[in-house]
Interface confidence: medium
């Protein structure tokens, strides 16, 4: 049994890091493998993660962490029984994938303005809470070409756009994702999308 693709890990910088790897053949990850991880810090103890299958030869493990700070470094040992298959390390702050924003809501009752709001996925005491910026994706269900991205570079989890920038009488969907420049993170997953019917009063055309 050998590792074909070495484990790569990303952290949500809160409580979970996810590691994925591939074996050289079909593997029952949960029965055959164990990923041991240990914070390199003052008497920290080793913890065991039981991997799950992620495709035939792929495995994924969700490492639970009490909290994360930028200096944290973990040793990782991948075992098959008594055989050490791979040894490495992982610094969560250098491989951050933020949690996805939640509770995306479209408020259509403001005159000819769409207000989109969502929730910051981190509690106020987490470092990322004040460092997230967002991308909002809006698209038409009827027209695949009507697809746009709005970058929200301020901290407030909201976006205002004029309803008239979208077509009237059409259903739209929106979703939002987050990233943090301070840790050069990857983008989060997209939030669940929300749907609304766009309608606004067309101004009278002047001839």
């Amino acid at each position: 049994m050998k590792v074909l693709q070495e484990p790569t890990c990303v952290s949500d910088y809160m409580s979970i890091s996810t590691c994925e790897w591939k074996m050289n053949g079909p593997t029952n990850c949960s029965t055959e493998l164990r990923l041991l991880y240990q914070l390199v810090f003052l008497l920290s103890e080793a913890h065991t993660c039981i991997p799950e299958n992620n495709g035939g030869a792929g495995c994924v493990c969700h490492l639970l962490m009490d909290d994360v700070v930028s200096a944290d470094n973990y040793t990782l040992d991948l075992w098959a029984g008594q055989q050490l298959l791979w040894k490495g390390s992982f610094k969560p702050s250098e491989h951050v994938k933020p949690r996805a924003p939640g509770n995306l809501t479209v408020h259509t009752n403001v005159s000819d303005t769409l207000l989109l709001t969502w929730s910051n996925p981190y509690p106020p005491d987490n470092y990322l809470y004040n460092h997230l910026t967002y991308a909002v994706n809006i698209w038409s269900e009827n027209d695949p070409a009507d697809f746009r991205i709005y970058n929200v570079t301020y901290l407030e989890p909201s976006l205002r756009i004029a309803a008239s920038t979208l077509k009237s009488g059409i259903s739209y969907r929106a979703r939002v994702r987050a990233w943090a420049q301070c840790y050069n993170t990857t983008w989060s997953e997209w939030s669940p999308s929300t749907k609304w019917h766009n309608s606004y009063r067309e101004p009278f055309e002047q001839h």
């Epitope: 003052l42 008497l43 920290s44 103890e45 909290d67 700070v69 930028s70």
Partner: antibody, heavy 121, light 107 residues
Framework: EVQLLESGGGLLQPGGSLRLSCAAS????????MSWVRQAPGRGLEWVSA????????SYADSVKGRFTSSRDNSKNTLYLQMNSLRAEDTAVYYC??????????????WGRGTLVTVSS | EIVLTQSPATLSLSPGERATLSCRAS??????LAWYQQKPGQAPRLLIY???NRATGIPARFSGSGSGTDFTLTISSLEPEDFGVYYC?????????FGGGTKVEIK
């Protein structure tokens, strides 16, 4: 009730031995690393020793290394400090303290009331 | 070992006044610094950990700041029960060390 209760302190002569105990209640004891911290009369706090949740790993202040041994019995929810070759400068109130999170996170959010150890001839 | 130096040694203030306590480390401790309060005959009580995080049940008038080598504990408006000795503690490296303490007394 969540608490730590030390016992075993007393008066003894230099060179003597003593074992302190710290009984924990209301917490999942084995989850948490623990420490002993002491305070000489009228003085500040001095960290003495630390032990991991499983008891596998320990660390000691230089002033007690080789003389004091920290251990724990997770089945009894009890922490111990075996003190040998005691000196006058070991006279202090000894506190056991629990780390704030299972990480371990070496700040202490739960302390016992302390037990007084007096070493004097 | 990392030496923590607290200043001033004694702070004489009246209830309602603002208290500012300092703790300086001999080398960087990142943000791994905590503050404790101790009253006579009692065990210490954790106030702040990791420089600025208030421990459970600690009133908002207590706040911590700083990183690296210089840290501050601020009590925005002293209450009668806030008088006592305050210690800083680092968890950046062995041995764990405490500062010598700052006594906050009633003026």
């Amino acid at each position: 009730e969540v608490q730590l209760l030390e016992s075993g302190g007393g008066l003894l002569q230099p060179g003597g031995s003593l074992r302190l105990s710290c009984a924990a209640s209301g917490i999942t004891f084995s989850t948490y690393a623990m420490s002993w911290v002491r305070q000489a009369p009228g003085r500040g706090l001095e960290w003495v020793s630390a032990i991991s949740g499983s008891g596998d790993s320990t660390s000691y202040a230089d002033s007690v290394k080789g003389r004091f041994t920290s251990s724990r019995d997770n089945s009894k929810n009890t922490l111990y400090l075996q003190m040998n070759s005691l000196r006058a400068e070991d006279t202090a109130v000894y506190y056991c303290a629990k780390v704030i999170a299972a990480r371990p996170h070496w700040n202490f959010d739960l302390w016992g009331r302390g037990t007084l150890v007096t070493v004097s001839s | 070992e990392i030496v923590l130096t607290q200043s001033p040694a004694t702070l004489s203030l009246s209830p309602g006044e603002r208290a500012t306590l300092s703790c300086r480390a001999s080398q960087s401790v990142s943000r791994y610094l905590a503050w404790y309060q101790q009253k006579p005959g009692q065990a210490p009580r954790l106030l702040i950990y990791d420089a600025s995080n208030r421990a459970t049940g600690i009133p908002a008038r207590f706040s911590g700041s700083g990183s690296g080598t210089d840290f501050t504990l601020t009590i925005s408006s002293l209450e009668p029960e806030d008088f006592g000795v305050y210690y800083c503690q680092q968890r950046s490296d062995w041995p764990l060390t405490f500062g010598g303490g700052t006594k906050v007394e009633i003026k």
